[in-house]
């Protein structure tokens, strides 16, 4: 029950996180005009990853896309790439995790497969979250550098007769959305990885002992999660699921993880 809850919660948290990463990537307010200690202009400038916008005092807003690819700063391209990679990995992770959810039954999918899929999606979410956090942090660092450079220009560039109104940019709402969303995706991924451990049964160093009753065979497996009754299919003590208790032959054939301790 706890495993299902952890997996489900991990999925939901990751879903919210990835939605946030997508929202942040699409938002125009990655950097906004700094209004503090600046000449008050009648226009408000803000910029995103894909376009820059100017809002007039009337509220009229005009946005222009960055129609060049080669002319854009390498850092901006890198941030775009990180965010897109984050979204793609997150989307694939979501797709994989839907099939991995314990509460959803798809055909005769074994729990071991679900465990592997849960782990895969968890890792994808972690990488997705890290990509988003990295992208936002790179952009934030770029802003801080430019902010102090333009501040220095404001106070050193006054030698000439003509002054310029320096437009300094500070952190926009998208950065905070991105950081939070990346964090949520990361947390969701960690939760999925934790859930995976619960889904995959622990291997044991006990050898399975078979007791053959006269009527029908019952395999008693001390370290296992299930006892197999001899009705129907499992009369020959075949393994019940990967990573679970094994028959005497199998334990001898394949070393247990405990053998390496």
């Amino acid at each position: 029950m706890a495993v299902t809850a952890c997996q489900g919660l991990g999925f939901v948290v990751s879903l919210i996180g990835i939605a946030g990463i997508i929202a942040a990537t699409c938002m125009d307010q990655w950097s906004t005009q700094d209004l503090y200690n600046n000449p008050v202009t009648a226009v408000f400038n803000y910029q995103g990853l894909w376009r820059s916008c100017v809002r007039e005092s009337s509220g009229f807003t005009e946005c222009r896309g960055y129609f060049t690819l080669l002319g854009l700063p390498a850092m901006l391209q890198a941030v775009r790439a990180l965010m897109i990679v984050g979204i793609v990995l997150g989307a694939i992770g979501l797709l994989v995790s839907i099939f991995a959810l314990k509460c959803i039954r798809i055909g005769s999918m074994e729990d071991s497969a679900k465990a592997n899929m849960t782990l895969t999606s968890g890792i994808m979410f972690i990488v997705s979250g890290l990509c988003a956090i990295a992208g936002v942090s790179v952009f934030a660092n770029m802003l801080v550098t430019n902010f102090w450079m333009s501040t220095a220009n404001m106070y050193t560039g006054m030698g000439g007769m003509v002054q310029t109104v320096q437009t300094r940019y500070t952190f926009g709402a998208a950065l905070f959305v991105g950081w939070v969303a990346g964090g949520l995706t990361l947390i969701g991924g960690v939760m999925m990885c934790i859930a995976c451990r619960g889904l995959a049964p622990e291997e044991t160093n006990y050898k399975a002992v078979s007791y053959h009753a006269s009527g029908h065979s019952v395999a008693y497996k001390p370290g296992g999660f299930k006892a197999s009754t001899g009705f129907g299919s499992n009369t020959k003590n075949k393994k019940i699921y990967d990573g679970g208790a094994r028959t005497e032959d199998e334990v001898q054939s394949y070393p247990s993880k405990h053998d390496y301790v």
């Epitope: 005009q33 000449p39 008050v40 202009t41 009648a42 226009v43 400038n45 803000y46 910029q47 820059s52 916008c53 100017v54 007039e56 005092s57 009337s58 509220g59 009229f60 005009e62 222009r64 003509v162 002054q163 310029t164 109104v165 437009t167």
Partner: antibody, heavy 119, light 113 residues
Framework: QVQLQQPGAELVKPGASVKVSCKAS????????MHWVKKRPGQGLEWIGG????????NYNHKFKGKATLTVDKASNTAYMQLSSLTSEDSAVYYC????????????WGQGTVVTVSA | DIVMTQSPSSLTVTPGEKVTMNCKSS????????????VTWYQQKPGQPPKLLMF???TRESGVPDRFTGSGSGTDFTLIISSVQAEDLAVYHC?????????FGSGTKLEIK
């Protein structure tokens, strides 16, 4: 077509106050900034300040802070400018002007109110 | 405050002539965000309120004859009347509508011979 109606003239005594009105018709009053401009004979135009009727947000020229107070009455589509502690320096033509939607320029102007400060 | 300096203060021309008037600002009025210059030109005929002619330095207001042309960038701006008509007799004001407080030039008075 937007029209801004202002009273033609106001005669006031020194030290007194005057409230100049500007009634807008033919547009969504709350959307656009309403600016006030002063024009003295032989001098250039001076921007006093502006008010956005939607939220009563104001911007003043620091030169006129304490002198002019801008208000709006959304119900009657009217903007007001109150000038206090009047002196002969305040004798001028006062225009109200409505800001454009697409830019910060003043698209529509009232005919102006001549304020005369005289004992 | 940004100071707007207009020149000449007045000029007298004959109808059909080309007229150039200048406006210089003490600070750049170019907004880096959209590469627009926030300078507006107004025409004020005797006994009338000002009328919007040109915004963003070079965008003509609807209904304004195409003989009026605005140009310039940063701190230097120009209003050109390609062929002056008798009805163009007026004072022309340039305005900074970029940085608060908005400021106007002292005006250029155009007189017709």
């Amino acid at each position: 077509q937007v029209q801004l109606q202002q009273p033609g003239a106001e005669l006031v005594k020194p030290g007194a106050s005057v409230k100049v009105s500007c009634k807008a018709s033919g547009s969504t009053f709350t959307t656009y900034w309403m600016h006030w401009v002063k024009k003295r004979p032989g001098q250039g135009l001076e921007w006093i300040g502006g008010i956005r009727p939607f939220d009563s947000n104001t911007n003043y020229n620091h030169k006129f802070k304490g002198k002019a107070t801008l208000t709006v009455d959304k119900a009657s589509n009217t903007a007001y400018m109150q000038l206090s502690s009047l002196t002969s320096e305040d004798s001028a033509v006062y225009y109200c002007a409505m800001g454009a939607y697409y830019s910060n320029s003043f698209a529509y102007w009232g005919q102006g109110t001549v304020v005369t400060v005289s004992a | 405050d940004i100071v707007m300096t207009q020149s000449p203060s007045s000029l007298t021309v004959t109808p059909g002539e080309k007229v150039t008037m200048n406006c210089k600002s003490s600070q750049s009025l170019l907004n880096s965000g959209n590469q627009k210059n926030y300078v507006t030109w107004y025409q004020q005929k005797p006994g009338q309120p000002p009328k919007l002619l040109m915004f963003w330095a070079s965008t003509r207001e609807s209904g304004v004859p195409d003989r009026f042309t605005g140009s310039g960038s940063g701190t230097d701006f120009t209003l050109i009347i390609s062929s002056v008509q008798a009805e163009d007799l007026a004072v022309y004001h340039c305005q900074n509508d970029y940085v608060y407080p908005f400021t106007f030039g002292s005006g250029t008075k155009l007189e017709i011979k």
